[in-house]
Amino acid sequence: NKILVKQSPMLVAYDNAVNLSCKYSYNLFSREFRASLHKGLDSAVEVCVVYGNYSQQLQVYSKTGFNCDGKLGNESVTFYLQNLYVNQTDIYFCKIEVMYPPPYLDNEKSNGTIIHVKGKHLCPSPLFPGPSKP
């Protein structure tokens, strides 16, 4: 028996920040679980981990240097990411593991979310255009 995960197909990270909601076909209330976000088609980079233990305070960390936070809903975990790099534009996959109570459960691989990180571009104001090129 696998948990199903729904994610937005695409998100745009303005100001190098984004919120990605992972919606599960499972109620996480009063469960011990490990929700994680993975980067890349092969999910090779574990971006962020949110560890929940019976509705107590979530423990959040990243072993790969990402600035992240997490929020728990009954059937969702939202990952908040800050300070993303433009070159971190990629596909991101939600993963969930329920450790307790038994049986251990995890998810079917989701379709993922493409996060497009927009760079900060300083555009010239139309009132003060840059020098014209001959």
Partner: antibody, heavy 120, light 107 residues
């Protein structure tokens, strides 16, 4: 005026516990992330723990994970750090610091610190 | 974890002189770098954030520059109250880290 006042430090034996407190005033405490940063005698600053604005999530440095617990009471405008399993290397001044929720790790105001000494 | 290396460890100058402090990151932190001042027995105070923005109430003699891996804090003309230890700190990557500090002392 923003004020952060730490308390609860003291002399404790290795393996012992303490609960540090940080009383906040002069700003809307419940809107800010809060942090603990420590400084061993004569050394530099080291980030320890953080908690988000509503207290629902936390992160800890690897060196204290499983031993230290950060919490907050927004009704009392107070931040806490429960420190267990203390070691000699935990001897430091512990500062609480405020961070804006839009810049999680920009520490714009700091308390005066409370000294924790771990010694037998 | 990103390592920040500050130089020099100690800077001996006279009031009125210009102080130039350096902070080098082990990898790019873009412009997510702050500078703090700490006087003996006191808490750190935020001076500069995001490499070049002065915090509230910080005098104009303090300025920051740089991006990527190399950053500079400049005090244009040292006042007696500026003699202290200065730390840089990055928030680009988790966990946040600090440099080991530069002490600016009276010559």
């Amino acid at each position: 005026e923003v004020q952060l006042v730490e308390s609860g430090g003291g002399l404790v034996q290795p393996g012992g516990s303490l609960r540090l407190s940080c009383a906040a005033s002069g700003f809307t405490f419940s809107s800010y992330w809060m942090h603990w940063v420590r400084q061993a005698p004569g050394k530099g600053l080291v980030w320890v723990s953080r908690i988000n604005s509503d207290g629902s999530s936390a992160s800890h440095a690897d060196s204290v994970k499983g031993r230290f617990t950060i919490s907050r009471d927004n009704a009392k405008n107070t931040l806490y750090l429960q420190v267990n399993g203390l070691r000699a290397e935990d001897t430091a001044v512990y500062y609480c610091a405020r961070a804006d929720s839009s810049s999680w790790y920009k520490f714009d105001y700091w308390g005066q610190g409370t000294l924790v000494t771990v010694s037998s | 974890e990103i390592v920040l290396t500050q130089s020099p460890a100690t800077l001996s100058l006279s009031p009125g002189e210009r102080a130039t402090l350096s902070c080098r990151a082990s990898q790019s932190v873009r412009s997510y770098l702050a500078w703090y001042q700490q006087k003996p027995g006191q808490a750190p105070r935020l001076l500069i954030y995001d490499a070049s923005n002065r915090a509230t109430g910080i005098p104009a003699r303090f300025s920051g520059s740089g991006s990527g891996t190399d950053f500079t804090l400049t005090i244009s003309s040292l006042e007696p109250e500026d003699f202290a230890v200065y730390y840089c700190q990055q928030r680009s990557n988790w966990p946040p880290t600090f440099g080991q500090g530069t002490k600016v002392e009276i010559k």
